[in-house]
Amino acid sequence: GSERTCCPVNWVEHERSCYWFSRSGKAWADADNYCRLEDAHLVVVTSWEEQKFVQHHIGPVNTWMGLHDQNGPWKWVDGTDYETGFKNWRPEQPDDWYGHGLGGGEDCAHFTDDGRWNDDVCQRPYRWVCETELDKASQEPPLL
């Protein structure tokens, strides 16, 4: 069938998931589109162990994850329950800060330089991480 049993080239396998780490930036929605076109999703962090794995690979760089509150409540892109799930916000975050002067608040979550989470303006061009679970139809390895 079309199910994948190993990760594509340039993806990293960890705990039955495949992860892809960008090295340049896009706005949150465009990062989300990239992952979806690869039959993946922006990374959903469900445990401290997964947090440390991702943090190790991205280093001290602002990086989008699959968590947003653009429609009101905070939601993970794959439907994982936010309220009962793992969280790793920086102190006093999320704050939906309006003082940046870019219009609106802050609706998209990212890893900060120390790995803890912050909400920020979704249009900022940050790096991102895609995730897809093994044993399901998946994405093409880079061909270019």
Partner: antibody, heavy 122, light 107 residues
């Protein structure tokens, strides 16, 4: 041989429907994101729609959203574009194109078909 | 959406000359930019991706440069088969968009 071959174009009246097909060969179609790009006579290129390898995610240009539907049958190595409520401004050569993925996080059209002409006229 | 403006619209040159084509984005696209060549009656062909990387099988006379909003495609010495229309395309923001094209014609 690595190739894409479109079919299904033709003359259709405004408000009518047409279904384009694109037969792929020579590469692993089932894991490849695919797209449709069109070119009106004497004009430039316009992206129309895209679909992920497994078909789970689809994307559309605003100009065709709600009227066109992209789909694929990986068992047949075939990409489709169902076009409804056609307008005169949809007249164009429609190209099927494979989206190559780069390590930087870009998607570019690295393989194109020869195109099929769709003419919308009464 | 991001608007890509190509200039000049037409470039009249002789074989052996250097061609310099410009593509300017309405906002930064980082390095998410590609160049395509299209000859009459044919489909486009990918030349350059990620602003400066040559696609498979593309001769070394084609080179791309730039980042942010200003990009350049250079053909170091025009061969007869290089006379065609050239398009730039960005994949920084949805939707994917193309420039209006530059026609390189024989002088």
């Amino acid at each position: 041989e690595v190739q894409l071959l479109e079919s299904g174009g033709g003359l259709v009246q405004p408000g009518g429907s047409l279904r384009l097909s694109c037969a792929a060969s020579g590469f692993t179609f089932s894991t490849s994101p695919m797209s449709w790009v069109r070119q009106a006579p004497g004009k430039g290129l316009e992206w129309v729609s895209a679909i992920s390898g497994a078909g789970a995610s689809t994307f559309y240009a605003d100009s065709v959203k709600g009227r066109f539907t992209i789909s694929r049958d990986n068992s047949k190595n075939t990409l489709y574009l169902q076009m409804n409520s056609l307008r005169a401004e949809d007249t164009a050569v429609y190209y099927c194109a494979k989206l190559g993925t780069t390590v930087s996080g870009g998607h570019y059209f690295d393989l194109w078909g020869r195109g099929t002409l769709v003419t919308v006229s009464s | 959406e991001i608007v890509l403006t190509q200039s000049p619209a037409t470039l009249s040159l002789s074989p052996g000359e250097r061609a310099t084509l410009s593509c300017r984005a309405s906002q930064s696209v980082s390095s998410y930019l590609a160049w395509y060549q299209q000859k009459p009656g044919q489909a486009p062909r990918l030349l350059i991706y990620d602003a400066s990387k040559r696609a498979t099988g593309i001769p070394a006379r084609f080179s791309g440069s730039g980042s942010g909003t200003d990009f350049t495609l250079t053909i170091s010495s025009l061969e007869p088969e290089d006379f065609a229309v050239y398009y730039c395309q960005q994949d920084s923001n949805h939707p994917l968009t193309f420039g209006g094209g530059t026609k390189v014609e024989i002088k």
